[in-house]
Amino acid sequence: ECRPGMICATSATNSCARCVPYPICAAETVTKPQDMAEKDTTFEAPPLGTQPDCNPTPENGEAPASTSPTQSLLVDSQASKTLPIPTSAPVALSSTGK
């Protein structure tokens, strides 16, 4: 089976031949806090089943196919950063202050 955050793109009998990063970010991706640059921050990984399995910048992700025109997959690399969260240990995100 594929690791969390991955999906089986090509599977053979009872096994996965090729795992790829899950191409659509979950809705609950974590937005970088404004004060992240000023202090070290630790994010606790959410419980299993709630993690945003995600490739934050899908090359071939597209905007919603539904009728809502307001949603967008555009990612502003300066304003809002989404971070994939692993399912194992908490992740310490330290900042250099840049």
């Epitope: 089976e1 999906i7 089986c8 053979a12 970010c25 597209e62 196919a65 809502s68 997959l73």
Partner: nanobody
Framework: QVQLVESGGGSVQAGETLRLSCTAS????????MAWYRQAPGNECELVSI???????YYTDSVKGRFTASQDNAKNTVSLYLKSLQPEDTAVYYC???????????????WGPGTQVTVSS
């Protein structure tokens, strides 16, 4: 219990179009992502498309620009519009619920019996 039923397959000539539909019971489409997989005879199962609960879509490179996934949450239906079909698109097409969480056998997700698409040149 999750049940998925695909429909809309058929035999067409190269360049023609089809619309596949997947109707679900036992859950609602405002929850898990839905995926379309396909499997040609003697081949491995291939991820074709994913559509998220809020309508975001992904397509594998070989179908990008030709296939379009959509959903109708009110009718608990997802669709895959196949245009400019090629002989290499010939396969059984399956829709799958929550493909991240349910990976077993030849395809990932809770899936239906599939619908056959045959494209002749």
């Amino acid at each position: 219990q999750v049940q998925l039923v695909e429909s809309g397959g058929g035999s067409v000539q190269a360049g023609e179009t089809l619309r596949l539909s997947c109707t679900a019971s036992g859950f609602t489409f405002d929850g898990p992502d839905m995926a379309w997989y396909r499997q040609a005879p003697g081949n491995e199962c291939e991820l074709v498309s994913i559509i998220s609960a809020d309508g975001r879509t992904y397509y594998t490179d070989s179908v990008k620009g030709r296939f379009t996934a959509s959903q109708d949450n009110a009718k608990n239906t997802v669709s895959l519009y196949l245009k400019s079909l090629q002989p290499e698109d010939t396969a059984v097409y399956y829709c799958a619920a929550d493909p991240r969480r349910n990976c077993r056998g030849n395809c990932c997700g809770n899936w239906g019996p599939g619908t056959q698409v045959t494209v002749s040149s």
